[in-house]
Interface confidence: medium
């Protein structure tokens, strides 16, 4: 029994569920199930029968390879799919594919929780906010990654003058997509709250930046 394969795909995509080996020769019957009990399609006596299910109209079986094509998968399609084959000899065989459908991650928003000058050092606390997703976080300072131990939704660090960065990027990713959010401080660590302006990502070619009045003026003249 065995043959368990894991597949992770992005929601909205078209998916092919298939096995890595050849089907038994001249098999008698082939059935695809969704979880234990819901038949999706059955091939028997040279014809395919599609069952009433949430897949009807968006699945197709290739009896030659046993592949099941599903169009526009959604998160609700997460499940173990079972392909059951009855061989001519009477023996049965099954393959299982555990399908995980993930939404692409949304673009993160970076919030400045705290920024403070401390004797030439800069204490910085940034949070990377995305709506309730299970994701990985990677922080970059001027495109250099921060150490692994700082990789979570909040970046809390004390920077010294020799390693100040102007721009901070939070990259959120899951196994099917990744998106960046960037915030730029100018001058490093000395922003007065009253001077901050938030520029939309459209204004800055897809990057969200927090910049000073001076930078804003400069930006509009180029």
């Amino acid at each position: 029994q065995g043959h368990l394969v894991h597949m992770t795909v992005v929601s909205g995509s078209n998916v092919t569920l298939n096995i890595s080996e050849s089907l038994p020769e001249n098999y008698k019957q082939l059935t695809w199930f969704y979880t234990f009990d819901q038949k999706i399609v059955e091939w028997d006596s040279r014809k395919s029968k599609y069952f009433e299910s949430k897949f009807k109209g968006r699945v197709r079986l290739d009896p030659q390879s046993g592949a099941l094509y599903i169009s526009k998968v959604q998160k609700e399609d997460n499940s173990t799919y079972i392909m059951r084959v009855l061989k001519k000899t009477g023996n049965e065989q099954e393959w299982k594919i555990k399908l995980q459908v993930l939404d692409p991650v949304p673009k993160p928003v970076i919030k400045i929780e705290k920024i403070e000058d401390m004797d030439d050092n800069c204490y910085l606390k940034l949070s990377c906010v995305i709506p309730g997703e299970s994701v990985n976080y990677t922080w970059y300072g001027d495109k250099r990654p921060f150490p692994k131990e700082l990789q979570n939704s909040v970046l809390e660090t004390t920077l010294m003058p020799h390693n100040y960065s102007r721009c901070y990027t939070c990259q959120v990713s899951n196994s099917v997509s990744s998106k960046n959010g960037t915030v730029c401080l100018s001058p490093p660590c000395t922003l007065a709250r009253s001077e901050q302006k938030l520029i939309s990502e459209e204004d800055l070619g897809g990057e969200q930046k927090l910049i000073s009045e001076e930078d804003l003026h400069h930006h509009h003249h180029h």
């Epitope: 029994q1 368990l4 979880t35 234990f36 173990t80 009855l86 009477g90 049965e92 099954e94």
Partner: antibody, heavy 117, light 107 residues
Framework: QVQLVQSGAEVKKPGASVKVSCKAS????????IHWVRQAPGQGLEWMGI????????RYAQKFQGRISMTWDTSTSTVFMELSSLKSEDTAVYYC??????????WGRGTPVTVSS | DIQMTQSPSSVSASVGDRVTITCRAS??????LAWYQQKPGKAPNLLIF???SLQSGVPSRFSGSGSGTDFTLTISSLQPEDFGTYYC?????????FGQGTKVEIN
């Protein structure tokens, strides 16, 4: 040799719950399905439900829906079946059966459960 | 749910006799049928799966046939150890359902 070893006999009062265990010796449950089947005295076999300890999927017969629960402890290769709100009609031998998905080619020895006031 | 109807409900035969038990499904189950033998106080034992495939270790005097809705278990030459109750079970869909059983007694 692969075996399904079940817990011992139980005597319960009406309204109580019973939890029967089924431990795999000789292999782990990864990728295997476990079914539960019961047999009342002098009666036939009645399918109760299925669990896949590997991915958490369960499916219960309509008759038991709402008062049956199948759980597992993968670290000890043990599956549990809990039946609540017991009635005298639940007096039966409870079997775990499994290994293959389509046919039960391995059975536990059965756990007798008596419901009596 | 798929109903499974077995007949006869009991049969009494002599050693060496040919015994036939039938099982009818309320809908087409292709070849997804299993036969079990159960002895008093014991768990069932798989004899036949996929309607006609003999489980390893089961004597060749047991055979199964049929597909769709009508199935047969045949014991070609009844032996003393073959007494017990025989059950068919559909394995096509959930819930799994069993026939009511056929009790085989040795004369």
């Amino acid at each position: 040799q692969v075996q399904l070893v079940q817990s011992g006999a139980e005597v319960k009062k009406p309204g109580a719950s019973v939890k029967v265990s089924c431990k795999a010796s000789g292999h782990t449950f990864t990728n295997y399905y476990i079914h539960w089947v019961r047999q009342a005295p002098g009666q036939g076999l009645e399918w109760m439900g299925i669990t896949n300890p590997n991915d958490g999927n369960t499916r219960y017969a309509q008759k038991f829906q709402g008062r049956i629960s199948m759980t597992w402890d993968t670290s000890t290769s043990t599956v549990f079946m809990e039946l609540s709100s017991l009635k005298s009609e639940d007096t039966a031998v409870y079997y775990c059966a499994g290994l293959r998905y389509w046919f039960f080619d391995l059975w536990g020895r059965g756990t007798p459960v008596t419901v009596s006031s | 749910d798929i109903q499974m109807t077995q007949s006869p409900s009991s049969v009494s035969a002599s050693v060496g006799d040919r015994v036939t038990i039938t099982c009818r499904a309320s809908q087409d189950i292709s070849s997804w049928l299993a036969w079990y033998q159960q002895k008093p106080g014991k768990a069932p034992n798989l004899l036949i799966f996929a309607a006609s495939s003999l489980q390893s270790g089961v004597p060749s005097r047991f055979s199964g046939s049929g597909s769709g809705t009508d199935f047969t278990l045949t014991i070609s030459s009844l032996q003393p150890e073959d007494f017990g109750t025989y059950y068919c079970q559909q394995t096509d869909n959930f819930p799994r359902t069993f026939g009511q059983g056929t009790k085989v007694e040795i004369n």
